[in-house]
């Protein structure tokens, strides 16, 4: 509930200063508190507008200050409203002279409907004129001079609503400044009735307390509360949870308070008289010292308070034994508390007798929502109440309270809530490579919307259209080796970031999916490279007979050695070869081959081959002849690569023979890097030449080599090959 | 906790008297307007009698009106409901309650009352 | 004295989904001053006392899940249930205390479809 409250101080208007202060308390209001004049009271009033400031000691508080000088514009009706949510209070007070002719008996007085009721002005100034009252500024009753008694009184003897107002008396030579006004409250039902129709039964408004005729509520005086205003606050507060404090030296002295209607205006407790400036006398106590102590066991009767009761017993005249009240304390509240946006749970927890019940204890949020406990519990001496919110966002960042209201009294306990944006991610994590069961992946989780500190974040990954929860893991690093996926798989993936509190997983950001391959097939069986021409290779492979459905192909992959030079070839799959073509003449490829479905082979061994070559092959190099015997020796030599060469051959006679007398040894297998020549003479002189041969010819020998067999009987000989010029 | 704790139901005959009670705990019992509730076996909630805090204002049904009677004794946070020339339509589960406002916040457990010959 | 009529008598409701008791007066329940609606929602289980869900017609009394809304102004009111649990089987009743003498609705039965 909107709990306002102005303070008019002083009503009675002299030379000193005057002020009106209209306080918000324990609550934001959407709109600012506004005073003003209030016409509908009083037509006629000063026009001037009011000067309203913030009152510099409280957070929602609006003041008016007249200094002496202005005392002649005071006169009149004010009032203060405020706004939440809709819902409007506005609180009415007056203003007159204290030089006035009349003074009124009391500010405001509420009555019931059907009342008898007596309004009544105290002649203070004797003139011989004719009094006149007013009411909300009309004429409506005049007494001729020499019956002015001493008492003025309008007399209503059934009070209805419509003689609610603005009652005035001044003498008819008077005007405004001398007039002296009171406010009659007449509540819509009749004692002890509230609702609509007034058919409803009022609870029990103590320490003056007025029931709200429209919601059954009570209103409690200034210095009391609770749901039945049986509880008194500290020496000098008040409010609804008696957290407002007078700072006056002598507390709330010259205080006149003003509440909504149909309360009106009264003292604080321990306080009476127009001006709130006189104590009560010994045995009353409460707002204008109304109430009376019966104190059932002789206790002190404190005029603030009522009966102050011994020990084991409690109540207004401390009738009832059990253990005295105690007003609720709110405890374990910290003052600032970090929340994560989405769900929060907030606790509030108090002590006080008896203990407060889950109605009893609220949470208000800075909008002024008021909360209920979802949930409670309570010990031997705490109550401990759990309220939900199911999306706490940024906006509801400020000042929230703990409130509790029980019949031992109210407190409430402001805090204040940071709400903060959980971190998200703003891209999504991309894929770096992939296989048939892993992926590495770059998290990216920089940059991100949200408020961080990042305490740690998530990996979440899933397969699409899989019907299984997210499957996530810790990531401390950006790159991130996922392991264990299925092959041919699409997987979903995304980041989760985690910030301080509890809650702090912000929601998943951006999505990428990505692929696995799928487990290959092997690579094609029996593979064979061959030079086909100077610019072809031929490879060969046994068919291919595949263990699924699926459509397969032989993909190719020939590269140059000595060039930067690499081109794949697609090759049916039931073709067991392929012409390499377009290639340069003796040159070096290296080809691999595999089968793919949808889903990539494996790649064989890598297969090397040179082209034909376009030009005749060089002489074989480091030619020795060794092992020589009587009868036999071994040639050995090396041959360069790529010039396509065939054989070799192995030319010899015995030296000063015609040359048609040679003997011509081929190898056909170019790998042969050596020849033991057999069957020779023994002490013989050979002539021998050695040469290579390729697709365009035979090489060229610059010179022949000498090879002289052993005597029979000796052992064998290594000869360096002595150069012998043809 | 407040509480309220009701007792004296029975089966009784038609013409016949009872008297129920509700016994109050946990709440300044004398500050509270009190209600009575009834439910009849399979039927809906009906309203039967209020009493003001201090026992001077009473209210009844009309169903009800000249055969109950509301009362409460504040010393003993004890409210009362005597019924008279009992019928057999006051066959019910009566409920003693504390209003918030104009709705009932705290209920009794329930008495049930069978009129029967 | 206001007549309340509730509707439908019974309802089935599968676990998880909104379940939606209107509550109809003989004459309006708002009250122009304050624009408050004096209307309230109860919950009882067999064998239960009634208990005070919502008053004000939607000011949800403290204890009662958030799931639980009062809605509606003047002769026409609902009480919904976002999402249905379990535990919300039992009778509803509404009751308007406009005007003594107080009066309930004849209840809905809620049940799990």
């Known amino acids: 509930a909107m709990d306002l409250i102005l303070i008019n101080s002083l009503p009675l208007v002299s030379d000193a200063e005057t002020s009106l202060t209209c306080i918000a308390s324990g609550w934001r209001p959407h709109e600012p508190i506004t005073i003003g004049r209030d016409f509908e009271a009083l037509m006629n009033q000063h026009q001037d507008p009011l000067e309203v400031t913030q009152d510099v000691t409280r957070e929602w508080a609006k003041k008016v200050v007249w200094k002496r000088e202005k005392a002649s514009k005071i006169n009149g009706a004010y009032f203060c409203e405020g706004r939440v949510r809709g819902e409007a209070i506005r609180i009415r007070t007056m203003k007159m002279r204290q030089q006035a002719s009349f003074l009124p008996a009391t500010l405001t007085m509420t009555v019931d409907k059907g009342d008898n009721v007596n309004i009544s002005f105290k002649k203070v100034l004797i003139k011989e004129e004719d009094a006149v009252i007013y009411k909300n500024g009309s004429f409506i009753h005049s007494v001729p001079r020499h019956e002015v008694p001493d008492i003025l009184e309008v007399h209503l003897p059934h009070a209805q609503p419509q003689d609610a107002g603005v009652y005035s008396a001044r003498y008819i030579g008077g005007n405004l400044f001398t007039s002296a006004f009171t406010r009659l409250i007449v509540r819509r039902c009749e004692a002890q009735k509230w609702g609509p129709e007034c058919n409803h039964l009022c609870t029990a408004c103590m320490n003056n307390g007025v029931c709200h005729e429209d919601t059954g509520e009570c209103i409690c005086p200034p210095g009391f509360m609770g749901r039945t205003c049986e509880k008194a606050c500290e020496l000098h507060t008040f409010g609804r949870t008696c957290k407002e404090r007078c700072s006056g030296q002598e507390g709330c002295k010259s205080y006149v308070f003003c509440l909504p209607d149909p309360y009106g205006c009264s003292c604080a407790t321990g306080w009476k008289g127009l001006q709130c400036n006189e104590a009560c006398h010994p045995g009353f106590y409460g707002p204008d010292c109304k109430l009376r102590c019966s104190c059932n066991n002789g206790e002190m009767c404190d005029r603030f308070q009522g009966c102050l009761c011994s020990p084991g017993w409690q109540g207004l005249q401390c009738e009832r034994e059990g253990i005295p009240r105690m007003t609720p304390k709110i405890v374990d509240l910290p003052d600032h508390i970090e929340v994560n946006s989405g769900k929060f749970n907030p606790i509030c927890k108090a002590s006080g007798w008896p203990l407060p019940t889950n109605e009893e204890m609220t949470l208000v949020k800075p909008d002024g929502t008021v909360l209920h406990p979802k949930d409670f519990n309570h010990t031997d001496h705490f109550s401990v109440a759990i309220f939900t919110i199911h999306r706490i966002l940024p906006p509801d960042s400020g000042v929230w309270v703990c409130s509790v209201n029980t019949v031992a009294g109210m407190v409430e306990k402001p805090f204040n809530i940071s709400v903060k944006v959980l971190p998200k991610p703003l891209n999504a994590p991309n894929v770096i490579d992939t296989g048939h069961n892993f992926a590495v992946i770059n998290i990216s989780s920089e940059p991100y919307f949200g408020d961080g500190p990042i305490k740690s974040k998530k990996l979440l990954y899933k397969p699409v259209n899989h019907y299984e929860a997210w499957q996530h893991i810790q990531v401390t690093n950006e790159i991130v080796t996922l392991n264990y996926l299925e092959p041919r798989t699409e997987y979903e993936l995304c980041v989760q970031l985690v910030r301080r509190g509890e809650g702090g997983e912000g929601h998943p950001g951006p999505v990428r999916r990505f692929t696995t391959a799928s487990i290959g097939l092997p690579p094609p069986r029996g593979l064979n490279l061959l030079p086909k021409s100077q610019t072809t290779l031929n490879l060969t492979w046994q068919p291919i007979f595949p263990s699924s459905e699926d459509d397969f192909y032989v993909e190719v992959e020939r590269r140059s050695v000595q060039k930067s030079d690499q081109q794949n070839i697609k090759v049916p799959g039931n073709l067991t070869s392929v012409l390499l073509n377009n290639l340069h003449p003796r040159e070096q490829y290296v080809v691999r081959a595999r089968v793919n479905t949808k889903a990539q082979g494996e790649w064989s061994e890598d297969l090397t081959a040179w082209t034909l070559s376009d030009i005749l092959p060089p002489q074989p190099e480091n030619i020795k002849i060794s092992n020589i015997t009587h009868s036999s020796a071994v040639i050995s030599w090396t041959i360069l690569d790529g010039y396509s060469i065939s054989s070799i051959t192995i030319r010899y006679k015995v030296q000063g023979k015609n040359e048609d007398q040679h003997v011509d040894v081929k190898i056909k297998n170019a790998t042969i890097t050596q020849y033991q020549l057999k069957g020779l003479e023994p002490e013989t002189a050979y002539q021998v030449d050695i040469f290579a041969e390729n697709n365009i010819g035979s090489s060229n020998p610059a010179f022949s080599h000498e090879l002289v067999t052993l005597p029979e009987s000796q052992a064998p000989a290594d000869l360096g090959g002595g150069k012998m010029l043809l | 906790q407040v509480q309220l704790v009701q007792s004296g139901g029975g089966v009784v005959q038609p013409g016949r008297s009872l008297r129920l009670s509700c016994a109050a705990s946990?709440?300044?019992?004398?500050?509270?307007?009190m209600h009575w509730v009834r439910q009849a076996p399979g039927k809906g909630l009906e309203w039967v009698a209020v009493i003001s805090y201090d026992g001077e204002n009473k209210y009844y049904a009309d169903s009800v009106k000249g055969r109950f009677t509301i009362s409460r004794d504040n010393s003993k946070n004890m409210l009362q409901l005597q019924m008279n020339r009992l019928r057999s339509e006051d066959t019910a589960v009566y409920y003693c309650?504390?209003?918030?406002?104009?709705?009932?916040?705290?209920w009794g457990q329930g008495t049930v009352i069978t009129v029967s010959s | 004295d206001i007549q309340m009529t509730q509707s439908p008598d019974s309802l089935a409701v599968s676990l998880g989904e909104r379940a939606t008791i209107n509550c109809k007066s003989s004459?309006?329940?708002?009250?122009?001053?304050?624009?408050?609606?004096?209307l309230a929602w109860y919950q009882q289980k067999p064998g239960q006392p009634p208990n005070l869900l919502m008053y004000?017609?939607?000011t949800r009394e403290s204890g009662v899940p958030d799931r639980f809304s009062g809605s509606g102004s003047g002769t026409d009111f609902t009480l919904t249930i976002s999402s249905l649990q379990a535990e919300d089987v039992a009778v509803y009743y509404c009751?308007?205390?406009?005007?003594?003498?107080?009066?309930f609705g004849q209840g809905t039965r809620l049940e799990i479809k």
């Open positions: 009751q308007q205390y406009y005007s003594a003498p107080i009066t």
């Open positions: 004459q309006s329940v708002l009250y122009s001053s304050n624009n408050k609606n004096y």
């Open positions: 004000w017609a939607s």
């Open positions: 309650a504390t209003p918030k406002g104009g709705a009932l916040e705290i």
């Open positions: 946990g709440l300044t019992f004398s500050n509270y307007a």
